[in-house]
Interface confidence: low
Protein backbone atom coordinates (compact mmCIF):
# COMPACT_ATOMS: atom_id res chain seq x y z
CA UNK A 1 0.00 0.00 0.00
CA UNK A 2 2.77 2.48 0.97
CA UNK A 3 4.78 1.60 -2.14
CA UNK A 4 1.68 1.85 -4.33
CA UNK A 5 0.89 5.30 -2.89
CA UNK A 6 4.48 6.45 -3.32
CA UNK A 7 4.79 5.55 -6.99
CA UNK A 8 1.22 5.32 -8.31
CA UNK A 9 -1.99 7.33 -8.34
CA UNK A 10 -5.43 5.72 -8.40
CA UNK A 11 -7.79 7.00 -11.10
CA UNK A 12 -11.52 6.48 -10.60
CA UNK A 13 -14.10 5.36 -13.15
CA UNK A 14 -12.67 2.97 -14.18
CA UNK A 15 -10.33 2.27 -11.28
CA UNK A 16 -6.75 1.97 -12.48
CA UNK A 17 -3.29 3.14 -11.46
CA UNK A 18 -1.08 5.62 -13.29
CA UNK A 19 2.54 6.43 -12.42
CA UNK A 20 2.67 9.29 -9.89
CA UNK A 21 5.07 11.17 -12.17
CA UNK A 22 2.13 11.69 -14.55
CA UNK A 23 0.37 13.85 -11.95
CA UNK A 24 0.23 17.54 -12.86
CA UNK A 25 2.08 17.14 -16.15
CA UNK A 26 -0.59 19.01 -18.12
CA UNK A 27 -1.97 15.79 -19.66
CA UNK A 28 -5.28 14.24 -18.62
CA UNK A 29 -4.18 10.67 -17.85
CA UNK A 30 -7.27 9.74 -15.81
CA UNK A 31 -10.53 9.65 -17.79
CA UNK A 32 -12.08 12.24 -15.45
CA UNK A 33 -8.90 14.30 -15.29
CA UNK A 34 -8.42 14.00 -11.54
CA UNK A 35 -4.65 13.61 -12.05
CA UNK A 36 -4.57 17.33 -12.99
CA UNK A 37 -6.93 18.52 -10.24
CA UNK A 38 -4.74 18.72 -7.15
CA UNK A 39 -1.86 20.66 -8.65
CA UNK A 40 -0.13 23.94 -8.01
CA UNK A 41 -2.56 26.50 -9.46
CA UNK A 42 -1.82 29.97 -10.74
CA UNK A 43 -3.99 32.92 -9.79
CA UNK A 44 -3.83 36.29 -11.57
CA UNK A 45 -2.95 39.51 -9.74
CA UNK A 46 -6.56 40.61 -10.07
CA UNK A 47 -8.28 43.95 -9.51
CA UNK A 48 -7.14 46.52 -6.95
CA UNK A 49 -8.56 45.82 -3.50
CA UNK A 50 -10.29 49.04 -2.46
CA UNK A 51 -9.17 49.03 1.18
CA UNK A 52 -5.70 49.04 2.71
CA UNK A 53 -3.92 49.57 6.01
CA UNK A 54 -1.20 52.16 6.58
CA UNK A 55 1.93 51.83 8.71
CA UNK A 56 0.66 54.95 10.48
CA UNK A 57 -0.93 52.99 13.35
CA UNK A 58 -2.65 50.50 11.04
CA UNK A 59 -5.12 53.15 9.89
CA UNK A 60 -7.72 52.20 7.34
CA UNK A 61 -7.74 53.77 3.88
CA UNK A 62 -10.48 53.44 1.27
CA UNK A 63 -10.24 53.86 -2.50
CA UNK A 64 -12.61 56.10 -4.41
CA UNK A 65 -12.79 54.05 -7.61
CA UNK A 66 -14.27 56.97 -9.56
CA UNK A 67 -11.24 59.19 -9.08
CA UNK A 68 -8.55 56.67 -8.10
CA UNK A 69 -7.87 58.67 -4.94
CA UNK A 70 -7.35 57.15 -1.50
CA UNK A 71 -8.94 58.55 1.65
CA UNK A 72 -8.43 57.83 5.33
CA UNK A 73 -11.40 56.46 7.22
CA UNK A 74 -12.89 58.77 9.86
CA UNK A 75 -13.90 57.13 13.13
CA UNK A 76 -17.32 58.87 13.10
CA UNK A 77 -20.11 56.25 13.00
CA UNK A 78 -17.64 53.45 12.29
CA UNK A 79 -19.07 50.11 13.45
CA UNK A 80 -18.08 46.51 14.00
CA UNK A 81 -20.00 45.60 10.84
CA UNK A 82 -17.92 48.07 8.81
CA UNK A 83 -14.74 46.66 10.35
CA UNK A 84 -15.79 43.15 9.34
CA UNK A 85 -16.60 44.32 5.80
CA UNK A 86 -13.18 45.97 5.49
CA UNK A 87 -11.40 42.84 6.64
CA UNK A 88 -13.51 40.60 4.39
CA UNK A 89 -12.52 42.79 1.44
CA UNK A 90 -8.93 41.83 2.25
CA UNK A 91 -9.89 38.17 2.54
CA UNK A 92 -9.77 37.80 6.33
CA UNK A 93 -12.42 35.66 8.00
CA UNK A 94 -11.44 36.29 11.63
CA UNK A 95 -13.06 38.79 14.00
CA UNK A 96 -11.38 42.20 13.72
CA UNK A 97 -10.59 44.76 16.38
CA UNK A 98 -10.61 48.51 15.83
CA UNK A 99 -10.06 51.71 17.79
CA UNK A 100 -9.88 55.46 17.33
CA UNK A 101 -6.51 57.14 16.85
CA UNK A 102 -6.13 60.87 16.53
CA UNK A 103 -5.44 62.47 13.19
CA UNK A 104 -1.72 63.13 13.36
CA UNK A 105 0.38 65.92 11.85
CA UNK A 106 1.70 63.61 9.10
CA UNK A 107 -1.74 62.73 7.76
CA UNK A 108 -1.52 63.25 3.99
CA UNK A 109 -4.92 62.02 2.85
CA UNK A 110 -8.37 63.56 3.17
CA UNK A 111 -10.37 62.00 5.99
CA UNK A 112 -13.91 60.87 5.15
CA UNK A 113 -16.75 59.08 6.83
CA UNK A 114 -17.31 55.51 5.68
CA UNK A 115 -20.45 53.59 4.82
CA UNK A 116 -21.16 50.20 3.23
CA UNK A 117 -22.68 49.23 -0.09
CA UNK A 118 -22.90 45.69 -1.51
CA UNK A 119 -20.44 44.36 1.09
CA UNK A 120 -17.83 46.95 0.15
CA UNK A 121 -16.77 50.09 1.99
CA UNK A 122 -17.72 53.37 0.36
CA UNK A 123 -17.31 57.02 1.25
CA UNK A 124 -20.41 58.69 2.62
CA UNK A 125 -21.67 61.05 -0.08
CA UNK A 126 -22.31 64.15 2.03
CA UNK A 127 -19.26 63.63 4.15
CA UNK A 128 -18.70 66.68 6.33
CA UNK A 129 -15.66 67.18 8.56
CA UNK A 130 -14.48 64.24 10.67
CA UNK A 131 -16.03 65.39 13.91
CA UNK A 132 -14.24 62.94 16.16
CA UNK A 133 -10.89 64.10 14.82
CA UNK A 134 -9.95 60.44 14.80
CA UNK A 135 -9.01 57.82 12.25
CA UNK A 136 -9.91 54.13 12.30
CA UNK A 137 -7.07 51.90 13.44
CA UNK A 138 -8.00 48.39 12.26
CA UNK A 139 -6.51 44.98 13.00
CA UNK A 140 -8.06 42.12 11.05
CA UNK A 141 -6.13 39.42 12.92
CA UNK A 142 -4.11 39.23 16.12
CA UNK A 143 -0.66 38.57 14.69
CA UNK A 144 3.06 39.10 15.04
CA UNK A 145 3.35 38.46 18.77
CA UNK A 146 5.79 35.90 20.13
CA UNK A 147 6.51 34.67 23.64
CA UNK A 148 10.19 35.52 23.46
CA UNK A 149 12.19 38.37 21.93
CA UNK A 150 15.41 37.33 20.18
CA UNK A 151 18.74 38.82 21.24
CA UNK A 152 20.66 40.86 18.68
CA UNK A 153 23.58 38.68 17.64
CA UNK A 154 25.06 37.22 14.45
CA UNK A 155 23.75 33.69 13.99
CA UNK A 156 22.42 31.50 16.78
CA UNK A 157 20.06 28.65 17.46
CA UNK A 158 16.45 29.80 17.57
CA UNK A 159 13.52 28.90 19.73
CA UNK A 160 10.02 28.34 18.37
CA UNK A 161 8.86 30.66 21.17
CA UNK A 162 10.51 33.50 19.26
CA UNK A 163 9.22 32.51 15.85
CA UNK A 164 5.89 30.66 16.26
CA UNK A 165 4.91 31.37 12.64
CA UNK A 166 7.85 29.50 11.12
CA UNK A 167 6.95 26.25 9.37
CA UNK A 168 8.84 23.56 7.51
CA UNK A 169 7.41 22.78 4.08
CA UNK A 170 8.17 19.20 3.17
CA UNK A 171 7.83 16.97 0.14
CA UNK A 172 7.86 13.21 0.79
CA UNK A 173 8.90 13.99 4.40
CA UNK A 174 12.00 15.93 3.25
CA UNK A 175 12.40 19.57 4.23
CA UNK A 176 12.35 21.68 1.06
CA UNK A 177 11.49 25.21 2.16
CA UNK A 178 10.51 27.41 5.04
CA UNK A 179 7.24 29.27 5.29
CA UNK A 180 5.24 31.60 7.52
CA UNK A 181 1.79 31.17 9.04
CA UNK A 182 -0.42 34.11 8.02
CA UNK A 183 -3.73 32.93 9.47
CA UNK A 184 -5.32 29.61 10.51
CA UNK A 185 -5.68 28.47 6.89
CA UNK A 186 -2.78 30.05 5.06
CA UNK A 187 0.99 29.70 4.86
CA UNK A 188 3.19 32.07 2.86
CA UNK A 189 6.25 30.77 1.00
CA UNK A 190 8.17 31.03 -2.29
CA UNK A 191 6.82 29.84 -5.65
CA UNK A 192 10.17 28.34 -6.68
CA UNK A 193 9.80 25.75 -3.90
CA UNK A 194 7.21 23.98 -6.08
CA UNK A 195 9.06 24.12 -9.39
CA UNK A 196 10.07 20.47 -9.20
CA UNK A 197 6.93 18.93 -7.67
CA UNK A 198 3.62 20.45 -8.72
CA UNK A 199 1.31 17.83 -7.22
CA UNK A 200 -0.27 18.93 -3.93
CA UNK A 201 -0.65 15.41 -2.45
CA UNK A 202 2.88 14.87 -1.17
CA UNK A 203 3.41 18.35 0.22
CA UNK A 204 3.03 18.72 3.98
CA UNK A 205 3.49 21.54 6.46
CA UNK A 206 5.07 21.09 9.88
CA UNK A 207 4.41 23.76 12.50
CA UNK A 208 5.12 24.30 16.18
CA UNK A 209 8.72 23.18 16.64
CA UNK A 210 12.22 24.44 16.06
CA UNK A 211 13.51 20.91 15.34
CA UNK A 212 13.03 19.58 11.84
CA UNK A 213 11.85 16.04 12.45
CA UNK A 214 9.84 16.34 15.60
CA UNK A 215 6.39 17.63 14.85
CA UNK A 216 3.25 16.28 13.16
CA UNK A 217 2.58 17.10 9.52
CA UNK A 218 -0.41 19.03 8.26
CA UNK A 219 -2.18 18.21 5.00
CA UNK A 220 -2.26 20.81 2.25
CA UNK A 221 -5.46 21.53 0.31
CA UNK A 222 -4.16 24.02 -2.27
CA UNK A 223 -0.94 25.63 -3.47
CA UNK A 224 -1.40 28.90 -5.33
CA UNK A 225 1.19 30.93 -7.24
CA UNK A 226 0.97 33.99 -9.49
CA UNK A 227 0.89 33.54 -13.23
CA UNK A 228 4.48 33.35 -14.45
CA UNK A 229 5.75 36.55 -16.04
CA UNK A 230 8.46 35.60 -18.55
CA UNK A 231 9.63 39.23 -18.76
CA UNK A 232 10.73 39.00 -15.13
CA UNK A 233 11.48 35.33 -14.48
CA UNK A 234 12.68 35.93 -10.91
CA UNK A 235 9.70 38.16 -10.05
CA UNK A 236 6.52 36.77 -8.49
CA UNK A 237 8.43 34.31 -6.28
CA UNK A 238 5.53 34.01 -3.87
CA UNK A 239 3.10 31.21 -3.07
CA UNK A 240 0.20 30.62 -0.71
CA UNK A 241 -0.54 27.19 0.74
CA UNK A 242 -4.04 26.54 2.01
CA UNK A 243 -4.13 23.96 4.78
CA UNK A 244 -6.77 21.25 4.72
CA UNK A 245 -7.76 22.01 8.34
CA UNK A 246 -7.32 25.31 10.16
CA UNK A 247 -4.50 25.59 12.65
CA UNK A 248 -5.22 25.93 16.35
CA UNK A 249 -3.08 28.78 17.60
CA UNK A 250 -0.95 28.35 20.71
CA UNK A 251 2.29 29.69 22.21
CA UNK A 252 4.27 27.89 19.51
CA UNK A 253 1.84 28.21 16.59
CA UNK A 254 0.89 31.79 15.75
CA UNK A 255 0.57 33.98 12.67
CA UNK A 256 2.95 36.73 11.58
CA UNK A 257 1.51 40.00 10.28
CA UNK A 258 1.57 41.02 6.64
CA UNK A 259 3.36 44.31 6.02
CA UNK A 260 1.54 47.57 5.52
CA UNK A 261 1.14 48.73 1.92
CA UNK A 262 3.46 51.70 2.62
CA UNK A 263 6.11 49.73 4.52
CA UNK A 264 9.18 51.26 2.88
CA UNK A 265 12.20 50.16 4.88
CA UNK A 266 15.25 52.38 4.66
CA UNK A 267 18.77 50.98 4.20
CA UNK A 268 20.33 49.61 7.41
CA UNK A 269 16.90 48.92 8.98
CA UNK A 270 17.42 45.83 11.21
CA UNK A 271 15.66 42.67 10.08
CA UNK A 272 15.72 39.00 11.03
CA UNK A 273 16.00 35.80 9.03
CA UNK A 274 15.36 32.25 10.20
CA UNK A 275 15.58 28.81 8.66
CA UNK A 276 16.81 25.25 8.62
CA UNK A 277 18.87 25.82 5.49
CA UNK A 278 22.44 24.88 4.64
CA UNK A 279 24.92 26.13 7.20
CA UNK A 280 27.76 26.53 4.67
CA UNK A 281 27.58 28.13 1.25
CA UNK A 282 29.70 25.37 -0.28
CA UNK A 283 27.25 22.67 0.66
CA UNK A 284 27.46 21.76 4.30
CA UNK A 285 24.24 20.15 5.45
CA UNK A 286 20.75 21.16 6.36
CA UNK A 287 20.53 22.37 9.95
CA UNK A 288 18.37 20.19 12.24
CA UNK A 289 17.85 23.14 14.55
CA UNK A 290 16.15 26.36 13.52
CA UNK A 291 18.74 29.13 13.15
CA UNK A 292 18.18 32.86 13.42
CA UNK A 293 20.28 35.82 12.35
CA UNK A 294 20.04 39.58 12.41
CA UNK A 295 20.57 41.32 9.06
CA UNK A 296 19.72 44.71 7.62
CA UNK A 297 18.11 46.23 4.57
CA UNK A 298 20.62 46.80 1.80
CA UNK A 299 19.86 49.63 -0.57
CA UNK A 300 18.57 48.44 -3.97
CA UNK A 301 21.00 50.75 -5.77
CA UNK A 302 23.88 49.13 -3.88
CA UNK A 303 22.40 45.71 -4.57
CA UNK A 304 22.23 46.47 -8.29
CA UNK A 305 25.74 47.93 -8.40
CA UNK A 306 28.46 46.91 -10.86
CA UNK A 307 30.00 44.46 -8.39
CA UNK A 308 26.64 43.04 -7.32
CA UNK A 309 23.40 42.10 -9.10
CA UNK A 310 23.60 44.70 -11.89
CA UNK A 311 19.92 45.37 -12.36
CA UNK A 312 18.50 41.93 -11.61
CA UNK A 313 16.87 43.17 -8.41
CA UNK A 314 13.52 44.66 -9.44
CA UNK A 315 11.11 46.90 -7.52
CA UNK A 316 9.26 43.78 -6.38
CA UNK A 317 12.36 42.47 -4.59
CA UNK A 318 14.53 43.66 -1.74
CA UNK A 319 18.04 42.89 -0.54
CA UNK A 320 19.14 42.11 2.99
CA UNK A 321 22.35 40.98 4.61
CA UNK A 322 25.22 42.61 6.41
CA UNK A 323 27.61 44.93 4.57
CA UNK A 324 30.70 42.85 5.27
CA UNK A 325 28.94 39.60 4.32
CA UNK A 326 28.95 36.33 6.21
CA UNK A 327 25.31 36.32 7.38
CA UNK A 328 22.73 35.23 4.81
CA UNK A 329 20.01 32.78 3.99
CA UNK A 330 21.07 29.73 1.99
CA UNK A 331 19.60 26.71 0.19
CA UNK A 332 16.78 25.23 2.27
CA UNK A 333 15.85 28.59 3.80
CA UNK A 334 13.86 29.50 0.65
CA UNK A 335 10.28 30.53 1.32
CA UNK A 336 11.01 31.55 4.89
CA UNK A 337 10.36 35.02 6.24
CA UNK A 338 12.46 38.15 6.29
CA UNK A 339 11.04 39.90 9.35
CA UNK A 340 10.75 43.42 10.66
CA UNK A 341 9.65 44.33 14.18
CA UNK A 342 7.63 47.42 14.91
CA UNK A 343 4.78 46.89 17.40
CA UNK A 344 4.41 43.42 15.93
CA UNK A 345 6.51 41.23 13.69
CA UNK A 346 5.83 41.65 9.97
CA UNK A 347 6.91 39.40 7.11
CA UNK A 348 8.39 41.99 4.76
CA UNK A 349 10.24 39.54 2.55
CA UNK A 350 10.31 35.92 1.39
CA UNK A 351 13.67 34.18 0.96
CA UNK A 352 13.95 33.98 -2.81
CA UNK A 353 17.36 33.94 -4.52
CA UNK A 354 20.96 35.10 -4.52
CA UNK A 355 24.39 34.00 -5.68
CA UNK A 356 26.43 32.17 -3.10
CA UNK A 357 25.51 32.54 0.55
CA UNK A 358 26.83 35.41 2.61
CA UNK A 359 28.99 37.10 -0.02
CA UNK A 360 29.67 40.78 0.77
CA UNK A 361 28.51 42.15 -2.58
CA UNK A 362 25.79 39.57 -3.21
CA UNK A 363 23.38 39.62 -0.26
CA UNK A 364 20.17 37.61 -0.12
CA UNK A 365 17.38 38.74 -2.44
CA UNK A 366 13.86 38.56 -1.08
CA UNK A 367 10.39 38.84 -2.59
CA UNK A 368 8.98 42.16 -1.37
CA UNK A 369 5.71 41.10 0.25
CA UNK A 370 4.19 44.59 0.20
CA UNK A 371 4.28 44.45 -3.61
CA UNK A 372 1.95 41.42 -3.52
CA UNK A 373 -0.63 42.43 -0.89
CA UNK A 374 -3.26 42.92 -3.58
CA UNK A 375 -2.65 39.42 -4.92
CA UNK A 376 -2.75 37.87 -1.43
CA UNK A 377 -6.03 39.62 -0.64
CA UNK A 378 -7.57 38.53 -3.95
CA UNK A 379 -6.55 34.89 -3.37
CA UNK A 380 -8.00 34.93 0.14
CA UNK A 381 -11.24 36.54 -1.04
CA UNK A 382 -11.65 33.91 -3.74
CA UNK A 383 -11.20 31.19 -1.11
CA UNK A 384 -13.43 32.66 1.62
Amino acid sequence: KVILDKYYFLCGQPLHFIPRKQLCDGELDCPLGEDEEHCVKSFPEGPAVAVRLSKDRSTLQVLDSATGNWFSACFDNFTEALAETACRQMGYSSKPTFRAVEIGPDQDLDVVEITENSQELRMRNSSGPCLSGSLVSLHCLACGKSLKTPRVVGVEEASVDSWPWQVSIQYDKQHVCGGSILDPHWVLTAAHCFRKHTDVFNWKVRAGSDKLGSFPSLAVAKIIIIEFNPMYPKDNDIALMKLQFPLTFSGTVRPICLPFFDEELTPATPLWIIGWGFTKQNGGKMSDILLQASVQVIDSTRCNADDAYQGEVTEKMMCAGIPEGGVDTCQGDSGGPLMYQSDQWHVVGIVSWGYGCGGPSTPGVYTKVSAYLNWIYNVWKAEL
Epitope: P230, Y232, D306, Y309, G311, T314, Y355
Partner: antibody
Amino acid sequence: QVQLVQSGAEVKKPGASVKVSCKASGGTFSNYAISWVRQAPGQGLEWVGRINPNSGGTNYAQKFQGRVTMTRDTSTSTVYMELSSLRSEDTAVYYCARGRYSSSSWGQGTLVTVSS
Amino acid sequence: DIQMTQSPSSLSASVGDRVTITCRASQSINNYLNWYQQKPGKAPKLLIYAASSLQSGVPSRFSGSGSGTDFTLTISSLQPEDFATYYCQQSYSTKWTFGQGTKVEIK
Protein backbone atom coordinates in the same frame (compact mmCIF):
# COMPACT_ATOMS: atom_id res chain seq x y z
CA GLN B 1 10.60 36.24 -22.62
CA VAL B 2 13.16 39.00 -23.09
CA GLN B 3 14.30 39.34 -26.70
CA LEU B 4 17.70 40.67 -27.69
CA VAL B 5 18.06 41.62 -31.36
CA GLN B 6 21.48 42.47 -32.73
CA SER B 7 22.58 44.47 -35.77
CA GLY B 8 23.70 42.80 -38.98
CA ALA B 9 27.06 41.39 -40.10
CA GLU B 10 29.98 43.76 -40.63
CA VAL B 11 33.15 43.56 -42.75
CA LYS B 12 35.97 45.87 -41.64
CA LYS B 13 39.55 46.57 -42.56
CA PRO B 14 42.36 46.19 -39.99
CA GLY B 15 42.73 49.33 -37.87
CA ALA B 16 39.10 50.34 -38.32
CA SER B 17 36.34 50.36 -35.66
CA VAL B 18 33.05 48.51 -35.50
CA LYS B 19 29.93 49.35 -33.49
CA VAL B 20 27.46 46.53 -32.83
CA SER B 21 24.01 47.18 -31.35
CA CYS B 22 21.75 45.03 -29.18
CA LYS B 23 18.12 46.05 -28.73
CA ALA B 24 16.10 44.64 -25.81
CA SER B 25 12.35 44.17 -25.81
CA GLY B 26 9.88 42.57 -23.43
CA GLY B 27 10.61 44.23 -20.12
CA THR B 28 12.05 47.20 -18.29
CA PHE B 29 15.31 47.98 -20.07
CA SER B 30 16.92 49.54 -17.00
CA ASN B 31 16.75 46.16 -15.25
CA TYR B 32 19.04 44.50 -17.71
CA ALA B 33 22.76 44.01 -17.31
CA ILE B 34 24.10 43.29 -20.79
CA SER B 35 27.31 41.34 -21.36
CA TRP B 36 29.12 40.92 -24.64
CA VAL B 37 30.67 37.55 -25.45
CA ARG B 38 32.55 36.70 -28.62
CA GLN B 39 33.39 33.48 -30.42
CA ALA B 40 36.11 33.25 -33.04
CA PRO B 41 35.55 30.65 -35.80
CA GLY B 42 35.92 27.15 -34.35
CA GLN B 43 36.88 28.56 -30.92
CA GLY B 44 35.27 28.82 -27.51
CA LEU B 45 33.37 31.62 -25.79
CA GLU B 46 35.24 34.71 -24.60
CA TRP B 47 33.77 37.43 -22.38
CA VAL B 48 34.42 40.96 -23.65
CA GLY B 49 32.68 43.08 -21.01
CA ARG B 50 29.44 44.23 -19.45
CA ILE B 51 27.39 47.37 -18.98
CA ASN B 52 25.34 48.07 -15.85
CA PRO B 53 21.86 49.10 -16.97
CA ASN B 54 21.26 51.51 -14.10
CA SER B 55 24.46 53.51 -13.86
CA GLY B 56 25.91 52.89 -17.31
CA GLY B 57 29.01 51.64 -15.51
CA THR B 58 31.14 49.13 -17.38
CA ASN B 59 33.45 46.17 -16.71
CA TYR B 60 35.81 45.12 -19.48
CA ALA B 61 38.05 42.10 -19.83
CA GLN B 62 41.71 43.10 -19.41
CA LYS B 63 42.45 41.94 -22.94
CA PHE B 64 40.09 44.53 -24.48
CA GLN B 65 40.76 47.43 -22.11
CA GLY B 66 41.42 50.60 -24.11
CA ARG B 67 39.91 49.17 -27.32
CA VAL B 68 36.32 48.51 -26.27
CA THR B 69 33.57 50.97 -25.30
CA MET B 70 30.09 49.95 -24.19
CA THR B 71 27.25 52.46 -24.07
CA ARG B 72 23.49 52.41 -23.70
CA ASP B 73 20.55 54.41 -24.97
CA THR B 74 17.65 54.01 -22.55
CA SER B 75 15.24 55.81 -24.88
CA THR B 76 15.58 53.04 -27.47
CA SER B 77 16.41 50.18 -25.04
CA THR B 78 19.63 49.60 -26.95
CA VAL B 79 23.17 48.74 -25.84
CA TYR B 80 26.20 49.30 -28.09
CA MET B 81 29.66 47.74 -28.17
CA GLU B 82 32.36 49.52 -30.11
CA LEU B 83 35.71 47.81 -30.75
CA SER B 84 38.51 49.89 -32.24
CA SER B 85 41.93 49.18 -33.79
CA LEU B 86 40.57 46.00 -35.30
CA ARG B 87 42.91 43.16 -36.23
CA SER B 88 42.30 39.90 -38.06
CA GLU B 89 42.07 37.96 -34.77
CA ASP B 90 38.98 40.05 -33.86
CA THR B 91 37.06 38.17 -36.55
CA ALA B 92 34.30 36.50 -34.54
CA VAL B 93 30.61 36.28 -33.83
CA TYR B 94 29.77 38.83 -31.11
CA TYR B 95 26.83 38.01 -28.84
CA CYS B 96 25.01 40.21 -26.35
CA ALA B 97 23.61 38.38 -23.34
CA ARG B 98 21.37 39.55 -20.54
CA GLY B 99 22.24 39.01 -16.87
CA ARG B 100 24.87 39.73 -14.28
CA TYR B 101 25.48 36.16 -13.18
CA SER B 102 24.03 33.94 -15.85
CA SER B 103 22.39 34.58 -19.19
CA SER B 104 19.17 32.92 -20.26
CA SER B 105 18.60 35.49 -23.01
CA TRP B 106 21.11 35.90 -25.84
CA GLY B 107 21.11 37.87 -29.05
CA GLN B 108 21.33 36.00 -32.36
CA GLY B 109 24.96 37.06 -32.82
CA THR B 110 26.69 39.50 -35.16
CA LEU B 111 29.51 38.29 -37.40
CA VAL B 112 32.36 40.80 -37.59
CA THR B 113 34.94 39.98 -40.27
CA VAL B 114 38.26 41.83 -40.25
CA SER B 115 40.04 41.45 -43.55
CA SER B 116 42.29 43.54 -45.71
CA ASP C 1 41.59 36.40 -13.80
CA ILE C 2 39.99 33.15 -12.70
CA GLN C 3 40.90 30.29 -15.03
CA MET C 4 38.27 27.65 -15.84
CA THR C 5 39.55 24.25 -16.99
CA GLN C 6 37.10 21.85 -18.55
CA SER C 7 37.64 18.17 -19.18
CA PRO C 8 37.50 16.30 -21.39
CA SER C 9 37.81 18.62 -24.40
CA SER C 10 35.76 16.15 -26.42
CA LEU C 11 34.04 12.82 -25.92
CA SER C 12 32.18 10.26 -27.99
CA ALA C 13 29.04 8.71 -26.57
CA SER C 14 25.93 6.84 -27.62
CA VAL C 15 22.27 7.67 -27.11
CA GLY C 16 21.27 6.52 -23.60
CA ASP C 17 24.78 6.90 -22.16
CA ARG C 18 25.46 8.74 -18.93
CA VAL C 19 27.83 11.61 -19.65
CA THR C 20 29.87 13.58 -17.12
CA ILE C 21 31.81 16.77 -17.83
CA THR C 22 33.97 18.41 -15.20
CA CYS C 23 35.05 21.99 -14.71
CA ARG C 24 37.75 23.21 -12.33
CA ALA C 25 38.26 26.81 -11.22
CA SER C 26 41.71 28.21 -10.42
CA GLN C 27 40.32 29.52 -7.11
CA SER C 28 37.17 28.99 -5.05
CA ILE C 29 34.09 30.43 -6.77
CA ASN C 30 31.50 29.18 -4.24
CA ASN C 31 28.53 28.18 -6.44
CA TYR C 32 28.84 30.98 -9.01
CA LEU C 33 29.06 28.49 -11.86
CA ASN C 34 26.85 28.12 -14.93
CA TRP C 35 26.68 25.53 -17.72
CA TYR C 36 25.71 26.32 -21.31
CA GLN C 37 24.96 24.18 -24.33
CA GLN C 38 25.83 25.44 -27.80
CA LYS C 39 24.97 24.02 -31.19
CA PRO C 40 26.71 25.10 -34.42
CA GLY C 41 25.58 28.49 -35.67
CA LYS C 42 23.43 29.11 -32.58
CA ALA C 43 23.77 31.22 -29.44
CA PRO C 44 24.60 29.40 -26.19
CA LYS C 45 21.68 28.12 -24.12
CA LEU C 46 21.71 28.23 -20.32
CA LEU C 47 21.25 24.77 -18.77
CA ILE C 48 22.34 25.11 -15.14
CA TYR C 49 22.90 28.22 -13.05
CA ALA C 50 24.41 28.63 -9.57
CA ALA C 51 26.12 25.22 -9.93
CA SER C 52 23.04 23.05 -9.47
CA SER C 53 19.84 24.93 -10.33
CA LEU C 54 18.10 23.69 -13.46
CA GLN C 55 17.07 26.52 -15.78
CA SER C 56 13.35 26.61 -16.50
CA GLY C 57 12.42 24.49 -19.55
CA VAL C 58 15.61 22.41 -19.47
CA PRO C 59 15.03 18.62 -19.31
CA SER C 60 15.68 17.02 -15.92
CA ARG C 61 18.26 14.64 -17.40
CA PHE C 62 20.71 17.54 -17.04
CA SER C 63 22.06 18.12 -13.56
CA GLY C 64 24.89 20.08 -12.02
CA SER C 65 26.82 19.64 -8.82
CA GLY C 66 29.86 20.92 -7.00
CA SER C 67 31.02 23.98 -5.13
CA GLY C 68 34.28 25.72 -4.41
CA THR C 69 36.61 24.74 -7.26
CA ASP C 70 35.25 21.47 -8.68
CA PHE C 71 32.02 21.19 -10.64
CA THR C 72 30.27 18.55 -12.70
CA LEU C 73 27.63 18.56 -15.41
CA THR C 74 25.85 15.22 -15.80
CA ILE C 75 23.53 14.11 -18.58
CA SER C 76 21.84 11.03 -17.14
CA SER C 77 20.69 9.55 -20.44
CA LEU C 78 22.08 11.16 -23.58
CA GLN C 79 19.46 12.04 -26.23
CA PRO C 80 20.09 12.73 -29.94
CA GLU C 81 19.48 16.47 -29.42
CA ASP C 82 22.17 16.61 -26.72
CA PHE C 83 25.09 16.28 -29.16
CA ALA C 84 26.61 19.76 -28.85
CA THR C 85 29.41 21.69 -27.16
CA TYR C 86 29.11 22.44 -23.44
CA TYR C 87 30.76 25.35 -21.63
CA CYS C 88 31.13 26.18 -17.96
CA GLN C 89 31.28 29.83 -16.94
CA GLN C 90 32.14 31.47 -13.62
CA SER C 91 30.45 34.66 -12.41
CA TYR C 92 32.16 34.89 -9.04
CA SER C 93 34.42 37.57 -10.45
CA THR C 94 32.84 40.61 -12.11
CA LYS C 95 34.95 39.53 -15.09
CA TRP C 96 33.42 36.34 -16.44
CA THR C 97 35.54 33.51 -17.74
CA PHE C 98 34.50 30.39 -19.64
CA GLY C 99 35.91 26.90 -19.84
CA GLN C 100 37.37 25.95 -23.23
CA GLY C 101 34.36 23.74 -24.02
CA THR C 102 33.58 20.03 -24.26
CA LYS C 103 32.32 18.69 -27.57
CA VAL C 104 29.96 15.73 -27.18
CA GLU C 105 29.96 13.69 -30.41
CA ILE C 106 28.12 10.60 -31.59
CA LYS C 107 30.10 7.40 -31.15
